[in-house]
């Protein structure tokens, strides 16, 4: 017998869509072999209508697709705009049509109910609103109007013009009688339930001269849209529920077995712990639509998601909903990177952010995830030379190593830098990754002085002490600016005396500024790297002042052994307009990253990357007026 399995019979009506799932053993050969859907002919052949290799028959053009889900061992054939001509015997299979790896499917498309027997058909989605129109003649204008539902053999009164409402419809039905000019009454039913489906009869008058009209109400549960995203990547659920629920609380939930749909996030402030740091619900538009972005996709994120609207912020009977089936592809194009990066207070982290290598010219961004309200991600730095004011001198985004990875360095770490950070670009929105920065106990590895003051016209030498653990690393000094950190010449002064239990492999490397000018004022970093991969950094602020006494200045380490300073920025710092990832690329693919006011605590930092990796690094958090 064939190992392929699927529905043996599919019954539908004209104009509908079907979604046929075929199951196969997910061996590596089966996962990658051709998948097909063919129609069996009278003489035994099977004519391909659609295949996974891109072929689509003219009969299916514009109305069918075939999607393979290799991780699940399934493929799905969607066929829309069904007609009775589609009725017949089909096969879904793997490999070549004539081979035995297939399953027989019988598709029967019957004529839609249409207006048979003067019945008006209403086809409405679950949770939405239907208006059933009921015409009547003049002689019944003043008489009782009513709507009945056929339950088995008996009509049951649903609503009438005398004020009766069936308890099953309480709070969600009304009967409207149009102005005297129109011989029409209508019944509006909101928050439609599956149980509302069925045959209705509206009636004007109660005697033999009454006017009657039949209605067939079909309530459709939305078929889930299939979404297939890469492990470690990102998914966006766009939820458009209509303007009638614009002011109702919105939610995204994930169905577990049974009738439970566990809230992932809602507009009432609830968020599932498993999505902490990697989810944003954008502010909804006036039409009630909203989007939810989830980054750092995990295998366990796969499943059925529903978005909806209900005052409770969770799924209830009558909630209008949209559905998705999320598959997470483990054969991901997005490389593994640490999901947690650890840094010592006063030290630094260097985070590698992946991006789509085909988009090397895209603008790179780094933002700090904030959980307040529905989540937001204010930008901290970009690759075009913008750095949030509070991060000047301690944050840099570098295009290195390139070819699909950029680097973000954050130093002068404090406990307030702990949190979740997102790497993203203005290109492929699926390449958004999340990293959590954790601040751990310990001592920075690099030792630099704290405050350094240089004198105009003199020479300044600033030491940086590198422990022996960095003996094989390249050591450098650079001057920070908002586009990066420009390398400067430095001198190796031999072994350092700053470390206990550290042999001759420790190093003292000095930065020398000759004939200091005002332009030399600013932040300087010393650090280590291996090729284009950056390690720990330490930052020193050099202030420049007028000459007081002649001679060159040689700064010793002793002056700077104070604990890391956790002050927020001085009020004298120049503020520039802040940027936040909120409405921009995270939600509307076509918008550029907008500049919006960000009221976040100025002393926090951020980075993106991803698995657990310890990093140290030294710097002091002293702030100076520019």
């Amino acid at each position: 017998k064939s190992p392929i399995f699927g529905p043996e019979e599919v019954n539908s009506v004209e104009g509908n869509s079907v979604s046929i799932t075929c199951y196969y053993p997910p061996t590596s050969v089966n996962r990658h072999t051709r998948k097909y859907w063919c129609r069996q002919g009278a003489r035994g052949g099977c004519i391909t209508l659609i295949s996974s290799e891109g072929y689509v028959s003219s009969k299916y053009a514009g109305r069918a697709n075939l999607t393979n889900f290799p991780e699940n061992g399934t493929f799905v054939v969607n066929i829309a705009q069904l007609s009775q001509d589609d009725s017949g015997r089909y096969k879904c299979g793997l490999g070549i049509n004539s081979r035995g790896l297939s399953f027989d499917v019988s598709l029967e498309v019957s004529q839609g109910p249409g207006l048979l027997n003067d019945t008006k058909v209403y086809t409405v989605d679950l949770g939405r609103t239907v208006t059933i129109n009921c015409p009547f003649k003049t002689e019944n204008a003043q008489k009782r109007k009513s709507l009945y539902k056929q339950i088995g053999l008996y009509p049951v009164l649903v609503i009438d013009s005398s004020g009766y409402v069936n308890p099953n419809y309480t709070g969600r039905i009304r009967l409207d009688i149009q102005g005297t000019g129109q011989l029409l009454f209508s019944v509006v039913i909101n928050q439609l339930r599956l149980s509302d489906a069925g045959q209705y009869l509206c009636q004007a008058g109660d005697d033999s001269n009454s006017n009657k009209k039949n209605a067939d109400l079909q309530v459709l549960k939305p078929e889930p849209e299939l979404v297939y995203e890469d492990l470690r990547g990102s998914v966006t659920f766009h939820c458009a529920l209509g303007p009638e629920v614009a002011n109702v609380a919105k939610f995204l939930c994930r169905q577990s077995s049974g009738e439970n749909c566990d809230v992932v996030v809602n507009t009432l402030g609830k968020r599932a712990p498993a999505f902490e740091g990697r989810i944003l619900l954008n502010p909804q538009d006036k039409d009630g639509s909203f989007s939810v972005v989830i980054t750092g996709l995990r295998k366990e994120d796969a499943g059925r998601y529903l978005c909806g609207a209900h005052s409770d912020g969770q799924l209830q009977e009558g909630s209008p909903i949209q559905a998705w089936q999320l598959f997470v592809n483990e054969e991901s194009t997005i490389p593994r990177s640490p999901t947690v990066v650890k840094g010592v207070a006063g030290s630094s982290v260097a985070v590698l952010c992946p991006y789509n290598r085909k988009e090397s010219k895209s603008i790179k961004y780094w933002c700090l995830w904030e959980g307040a309200q529905n989540g937001r991600c204010p930008l901290l730095v970009d690759s075009e030379g913008w750095v949030k004011a509070q991060y000047e001198g301690r944050l840099s985004l570098l295009e290195e190593p390139g070819n699909g990875t950029f680097t973000v360095i954050l130093n002068q770490l404090t406990s307030r830098d702990a949190g979740f950070y997102w790497c993203l670009t203005n290109g492929d929105t699926l390449w958004r990754t999340t990293v959590e920065i954790k601040i751990i106990e310990g001592e920075p590895n690099l030792k630099v002085p704290g405050n350094v003051t240089a004198v105009l016209g003199e020479t300044l030498k600033v030491p940086c002490h590198f422990p022996c653990k960095f003996s094989s690393y390249e050591k450098y000094w650079c001057k920070w600016n908002n586009t990066g950190c420009q390398a400067l010449p430095s001198q190796d002064e031999g072994p350092s005396k700053a470390f206990v239990n550290c042999d001759e492999n420790s190093r003292l490397v000095s930065l020398t500024l000759n004939l200091v000018t005002r332009a030399d004022e600013g932040w300087y970093w010393c650090g280590v790297k291996q090729g284009h991969f950056y390690g720990e950094t330490a930052a020193v602020y050099v202030a420049v002042e007028e000459r007081k006494a002649a001679g060159s200045r040689d700064v010793s380490l002793a002056k700077a052994d104070a604990a890391p300073d956790e002050k927020v920025l001085d009020s004298g710092f120049r503020e520039i307009e802040n940027k936040a990832i909120q409405d921009p690329r995270l939600f509307a693919e076509e918008k550029a990253v907008a500049d919006t006011r960000d009221q976040a605590d100025g002393s926090r930092a951020s980075v993106d990357s991803g698995s657990s990796e310890e990093q140290g690094g030294s710097s002091r958090h002293h702030h100076h007026h520019h």
Epitope: F5, P7, E8, E9, V10, N11, S12, V13, N16, S17, V18, S19, I20, Y23, N72, T74, T123, R193, L194, S195, Q218, V219, L220, K221, E223, Q255, S257, G258, E259, C261, R304, E317
Partner: nanobody, 126 residues
Framework: QVQLVESGGGLVQAGDSLRLSCAAS????????MGWFRQAPGKEREFVAT??????????YYADFVKGRFTISRDNAKNTVYLQMDSLKPEDTAVYYC?????????????????WGQGTQVTVSS
């Protein structure tokens, strides 16, 4: 909660027919599919047939061993699913369970079904 109650089981001769019914009550609004499983003495519970619906479209799935002999159907107005069993064989003897689900991955997988009835005994004598 969804409650499922099976009926229609009994003792029949090989070659005879039986019709099992499964009535669903309670909060049935999220149910996507209902099906039948069976468990013979000393054996694992196994998939028999499932019917899934979406609006006016329905999908029917059958196990290989019942193809052409069993038919699954439903009456939407009564929230009831039926299993018409024809040409019964002694090896069809088992307790038949009705099951319902709000999710549907592989319809053959027991763990896809959240709700189960108590079962009805079908005995086919030779």
């Amino acid at each position: 909660q969804v409650q499922l109650v099976e009926s229609g089981g009994g003792l029949v001769q090989a070659g005879d027919s039986l019709r099992l019914s499964c009535a669903a009550s309670g909060r049935t609004f999220p149910t996507y599919a209902m099906g039948w499983f069976r468990q013979a003495p000393g054996k694992e519970r196994e998939f028999v047939a499932t019917i899934r619906w979406s609006g006016s479209t329905q999908y029917k799935y059958y196990a290989d061993f019942v193809k052409g002999r069993f038919t699954i159907s439903r009456d939407n107005a009564k929230n009831t699913v039926y299993l018409q069993m024809d040409s019964l064989k002694p090896e069809d003897t088992a307790v038949y369970y009705c099951a319902a689900t709000t999710l549907l991955g592989d319809p053959r997988a027991l763990n896809e079904y959240a709700y189960w009835g108590q079962g009805t005994q079908v005995t086919v004598s030779s």
